[in-house]
Interface confidence: low
């Protein structure tokens, strides 16, 4: 992502366009790398990540990775370029506005991953696609 000493302004945003020719701005994502988590056996969870980060490249999307093994549960939140694999998996749902978790095969652990392309969309990770995100408690997001 952008080095913190670089001031982003209206004038120096990288000019990248989407398929329709519209200017595409870098994504805002939760970006706490790997943190221990208490998210378990729930239809959805908030990331509890206090950091909203501006992705370095306009094409990057938000990613969340939930992992559970015999010792702990972790949640990873990052920006990532969907053209590149992450944890050896393709980000097949990168265009989704919501972060819908999908299980991936990893030996020795339970591994779920999601990606999405709306601002801070990896703050609310969803394990059940029918989950209704209108719960007002979900709006009490932790950030600065």
């Amino acid at each position: 992502t952008i080095p913190p000493h670089v001031q982003k302004s209206v004038n120096n945003d990288m000019i990248v366009t989407d398929n329709n020719g519209a200017v595409k701005f870098p994504q805002l994502c939760k970006f706490c790398d790997v943190r221990f988590s208490t998210c378990d056996n729930q239809k959805s969870c908030m990331s509890n990540c206090s950091i909203t980060s501006i992705c370095e490249k306009p094409q990057e999307v938000c990613v969340a990775v939930w992992r559970k093994n015999d010792e702990n549960i972790t949640l990873e939140t990052v920006c990532h370029d969907p053209k590149l694999p992450y944890h050896d998996f393709i980000l097949e749902d990168a265009a989704s506005p919501k972060c819908i978790m999908k299980e991936k095969k990893k030996p020795g652990e339970t591994f779920f991953m999601c990606s999405c392309s709306s601002d801070e969309c990896n703050d609310n990770i969803i394990f059940s696609e029918e989950y209704n995100t209108s719960n007002p408690d979900l709006l009490l997001v932790i950030f600065q």
């Epitope: 982003k8 701005f25 870098p26 805002l28 206090s50 950091i51 909203t52 801070e120 950030f143 600065q144």
Partner: antibody, heavy 121, light 107 residues
Amino acid sequence: QVQLVESGGGLVQPGGSLRLSCAVSGFAFRRYAMSWVRQAPGKGLEWVSSISASGDRTHNTDSVKGRFSISRDNSKNTLYLQMNSLRAEDTAVYFCAKGLASSGKNYFDPWGQGTLVTVSS
Amino acid sequence: DIQMTQSPSSLSASVGDRVTITCRASQSISSYLNWYQQKPGKAPKLLIYAASSLQSGVPSRFSGSGSGTDFTLTISSLQPEDFATYYCQQSYSTPPTFGQGTKVEIK
């Protein structure tokens, strides 16, 4: 040049209301979370409230919940703090600050010059 | 909430002195620790972010170190413009909290 300019402070009676504004220029305001931080006379810094870049999410310190409301107008590059049911302990200089988070690091920078709110009868 | 405790609350030093200010968090905050300088009647100014990264434009005599719960701000050779109050702030979790400040005065 990045600038944050607060206004709207003044003397108000306990129970009264004020609306602070922070006019922003020099950066892409709509891309950043913004915050209010206050400083009581002769005291330290206290975070008050934050709002997401799009304005749909807010978070407040416990002591102002139900009384203060943060908002923003991205078309006007302006941040607001609506303060109701003011108390003597809300007397402070109120700073607006840009929240910049990159590479997983987070801090307040830069800050406005501050506006003084005095709650007294 | 995470409590941040700075020491000392104030100190007197001379130009050219090496000054060290410490900040302790009530729980581990990894390296999510920032340092600010504030002069009377002015807004705080970011000096150090992420415990040890120097903000652009800040003189190299300022440095930060530490991780977990214990952090240090060091001014290697105090200059006249460095007399001010310094605050640490954790950004590990909400609410972001500040230390009570350390006032650096002229001896």
